[in-house]
Every structure is written in C-alpha cells, then in structure tokens.
Interface confidence: low
C-alpha cells in the first residue's frame, strides 16, 4: 500500500491526461482525486501508464468504492481490468452487454482467466439466464465457453439462445452437456422444415434419444459418420439395421471403417448377422 503523503504544490491533477505518466507512484496517490479518476476512467486506457502506476489507480478506486465499482466505472476500466482479482469482480453488478464486451475485448486472444470467468458468472447470474445476445458475445470471444458450463448451469439457457450456438461451440461438450442442450435445440428449431431442421439440430444430436433418431431415419437426412459417431451409445443400440441405413443414407458405407469404434462396435454386436449382411459391408456381429 502506498504511504499517504500531501500533494506537492501545483501538482494537483485537474484532469486525467498524459502528464500523469511522469508522476511517481506516491504523487499519483496524493494528487489524483479518486472521484475525478472515476468520472474520467475512459481516458486511462489511452495513457501508457506502467503496471505500478495502474496499481495505484486501482487502489484509489478501491478506496472510493469499497463495496464494488459502479458499472459506469467498470465499463471504462480497459487494461485496468487485468489488475482486478476475482474477489474484486465478485463485488460488481454488471448488467450491460456493452460493459461485458468492453472487458472481454481487453482479454481478447488469451485463455479465459479466473477474472474473466468470474466476470461472466456475475453477468449471467445478474441476468438470470444465458440469453441469446450474451451467448452470441461469449462464444464469439470463447468458442469453447458453452462446453465449460456444468449441466446445471446449462439448464438456465433458454431455447431462444440456441440460435446463437455454432457447431464449433459444441466441439468439446460431453454427453451430459448435450443431454441438456438437445431438448432446448428441439424446441428452438421445431418450426423449421425437415432439411433445415436437420442442419440446425445436427450438432446437438449427441443428446438425442432413440425415438428422435428413429424419427430422423424417416426423413432422408443422410447423417454423416462424424455425427453418427457422436451419438449416445444407448440411443443407437435399439436402432434396427434398416433404421441406421435410412439414417445414414449414402454414408452407410462408412460403418465399415468405424466397425471397431463405439457406438458402431456396440451396435453391430446387437444386430442379427442376417440383417447386417443386407448392408453388404462385411460387418461381423
């Protein structure tokens, strides 16, 4: 902590400007009014302060707002955000998407830090749910964000938000997460016609039950093998050979290449050899 010293004569800062980069740490502490700093936070980012100087500015804001910064200050923190601890951020009440975007921009290109994770958590909890605009923003900055959430957290995603999800956002999701997301996707996309519906629902099918796979098999969807391999084993096992053939369409030949991998291996073992032979792929049960 910087020792309290009186501001030298003529050094009192009338505004936040570049002249402050020549101030020593103790001078910043003594000569910059915290309330002035709070109202002119947007200028801090344009001034090349050292990390040590930023520490002083943060300290001044902490003293002014011991219960947590107001959003008007948070939105303009810029690089000062990198100085915040998760404990600091837990005191904040961030409700504006613009504030969230501004702070995520500061961390852009880096892995999600504990600070960012805490910020997102505070923001989402403040909103009460992970709405479409928020999800759009978060997945743009962190494509793996959705799959970093627990199934319990995902349950707060309303179906309308699913429209913001891109296939790559689900790449690292495990089956438990897809179990939560799939029903929401079904509801979100339900009024689309068959072919459009399949394009949208495809990435979520790792959470689909057997009944829905059976239904899809009646709709000429031609599921690719990559999607088929991500289906739940317990959902695939009850499918008949005819249903899998209809589901995969021309991609059915790919089963041969995957016959030793789940869920194909387990599915083959459940089928009658006579039925497998109708595929003409030499699959052995």
């Amino acid at each position: 902590e910087v020792e309290k010293t009186a501001c030298p004569s003529g050094k009192k800062a009338p505004e936040i400007d570049e002249s402050l980069i020549f101030y020593k740490k103790w001078e910043l502490e003594a000569c910059v009014d915290a309330a002035l700093l709070a109202t002119q936070m947007d200028r801090v980012n344009a001034i090349p302060f050292t990390y040590e100087q930023l520490d002083v500015l943060k300290h001044k804001l902490d003293e002014l707002y011991p219960q947590g910064y107001p959003e008007s200050v948070i939105q303009h923190l810029g690089y000062l955000f990198l100085k915040m601890s998760p404990e600091d951020i837990r005191k904040w009440n961030v409700t504006s998407l613009e504030t969230l975007k501004a702070l995520l921009e500061v961390n852009k290109g880096h892995e999600m830090s504990p600070q960012v994770a805490t910020l997102i958590d505070r923001f989402v909890k403040g909103r009460g749910q992970l709405d479409k605009d928020t999800l759009d923003t978060l997945t743009a900055f962190y494509p793996g964000y959705l799959c970093s959430l627990s199934p319990e957290e995902l349950s707060s995603v309303p179906p309308s938000s699913i429209w913001a999800v891109r296939p790559q956002d689900l790449d690292t999701c495990d089956p438990r997460q897809l179990d939560v997301l799939y029903p929401k996707a079904r509801l979100a996309f339900q009024n689309m016609n068959g072919s459009e519906y399949f394009v949208k629902i495809q990435s979520f099918l790792g959470g689909a039950p057997t009944e829905d796979l059976k239904a899809l098999s009646q709709q000429n969807v031609s599921m690719d093998l990559a999607t088929f391999m991500k289906l739940r084993t317990d959902a695939v096992l009850p499918l008949t050979v005819a249903e899998v053939q209809k589901l995969l369409g021309p991609h059915v030949e790919g089963l041969k290449a995957e016959e030793r991998h789940r869920p194909v291996r387990d599915w083959i073992l459940r089928q009658r050899q006579d039925d497998l032979d109708t595929l003409g792929l030499g699959l052995q049960g």
Partner: antibody, heavy 121, light 107 residues
Framework: EVHLQQSGPELVKPGASVRIPCKAS????????MDWVKQSHGKSLEWIGD????????IYTQKFKGKATLTVDKSSSTAYMELRSLTSEDTAVYYC??????????????WGQGTTLTVSS | DIQMTQSPASLSAYVGETVTITCRAS??????LAWYQQKQGKSPQLLVY???TLADGVPSRFSGSGSGTQYSLKINSLQPEDFGSYYC?????????FGGGTKLEIK
C-alpha cells in the same frame, strides 16, 4: 409445483368471440410448448393446436384454422386461446396442457382445470 | 393426418382383474404415443409417454407397449380408482390426434 390456471365458465352469444387465458407457474414458461384441447360433452378429446411460447410459433389442426388463435404473454407467463365466430358447435370444455419435455416427446404432462364455454342466445 | 382407432369403446371389469386397451394408428407413429386417464368432471392425466414410459407418480400396475401402428395399455389388478375414461394420443406428424376413448366401468 407446476400449475396451469384457467378462467371460469363463459356464456357467450353466437357470432361473438372469447379469449381463454391459461396462467402457468412453477416452471420456465418459455421452455415448454403449450397445447390446447377441446372436449365436447360426453365426447373424446380433440387436439386444437400448440404454441411455442419462446418464439410465438403456432401449429393448428385444419379444423381450427381461422377458428382459434393462440398467443402468449411472456411477461405474465400466460397463454391465450381466442375463439371467434362462435356457434353452438363450439360449446365444450377447453383445456390448456403443457407438452412433456420438448417437441417430439409424446405426452401432455400438466393440464389446466378446463374452461367451460357455452354458446347460446 | 394420422387417425387413431381405440378399442374397445367401453369395458366393464371387476376390481383385481387385468384389462388391456388398444390403439391402432393409420400409419407408423414410431412409439410417439401417450396414454391418459380422465375421471368424470376432471382434467386428463398423463399415464404413459413414448409408448412405454410411465409418467411420474403412475403406479406400476399400468404399462404401455407396442410399436409401428399397434399400441396397448395394460392395467394389472384393477383398483377402484382406475375406473374412468382412457385416451391415446399420437405425436408423430404435425397434427396430434386422440383416439375415441375407452370408458372403463366397474362391474
């Protein structure tokens, strides 16, 4: 606890319109479709249509196109069915019912208590 | 639209008996079928969904079975509270029709 609260009995004149509310509580309103079902006295159940409260998308049976209009008010978690150009044929009990799970899963797991509509001059 | 034909239209049975109600669809409905019970003057209650899954709180004496176009609801060891009307409903195509109903009466 999930609850669907419908309004009391309605007596309306032929040619008039009526709007029946169904207030949902105990769950996230936008996460489940709401279906509407008609039951004439001593008869079977008749599916009218459904609405997706999240985006307002509706599906109606052919018979009820032009007769029924389904809407929702998300702010009050209330679904509505408006019936227009009423005749004695529309005299029945009308139920709202929540669709089990999501689109494609088969079942209406919670039902309102029903609104009795009587069309008579 | 797919039509649902339910039989029998009415049925009398003793307490303790086993009864079966059937529903035939005019096309393959791929297990997208529900069964409901309705008591006089009350709302229907879901018993079975996806053809064979018991809804929460439904006693195990109820069971659903079938596939393709033929489905049935079986009630083992009938209890006094089981009497009422039963309906099937399909959810396969866009328009989800109900069967005509079966009235189960006490002998």
């Amino acid at each position: 606890e999930v609850h669907l609260q419908q309004s009391g009995p309605e007596l309306v004149k032929p040619g008039a319109s009526v709007r029946i509310p169904c207030k949902a509580s105990g769950y996230t309103f936008t996460d489940y479709n709401m279906d509407w079902v008609k039951q004439s006295h001593g008869k079977s159940l008749e599916w009218i249509g459904d609405i997706n409260p999240d985006n307002g998308g509706t599906i109606y049976t052919q018979k009820f196109k032009g007769k029924a209009t389904l809407t929702v008010d998300k702010s009050s978690s209330t679904a509505y069915m408006e019936l227009r150009s009423l005749t004695s044929e529309d005299t029945a009990v009308y139920y709202c019912a929540r669709r089990l799970h999501y689109y494609g899963s088969s079942g209406l797991d919670y039902w309102g208590q029903g609104t009795t509509l009587t069309v008579s001059s | 639209d797919i039509q649902m034909t339910q039989s029998p239209a009415s049925l009398s049975a003793y307490v303790g008996e086993t009864v079966t109600i059937t529903c035939r669809a005019s096309g393959n409905i791929h297990n997208y079928l529900a069964w409901y019970q309705q008591k006089q003057g009350k709302s229907p209650q879901l018993l079975v969904y996806n053809a064979k899954t018991l809804a929460d709180g439904v006693p195990s004496r109820f069971s659903g079975s079938g596939s393709g176009t033929q489905y049935s609801l079986k009630i083992n060891s009938l209890q006094p509270e089981d009497f009422g009307s039963y309906y099937c409903q399909h959810f396969w195509s866009t328009v989800w029709t109900f069967g005509g109903g079966t009235k189960l009466e006490i002998k």
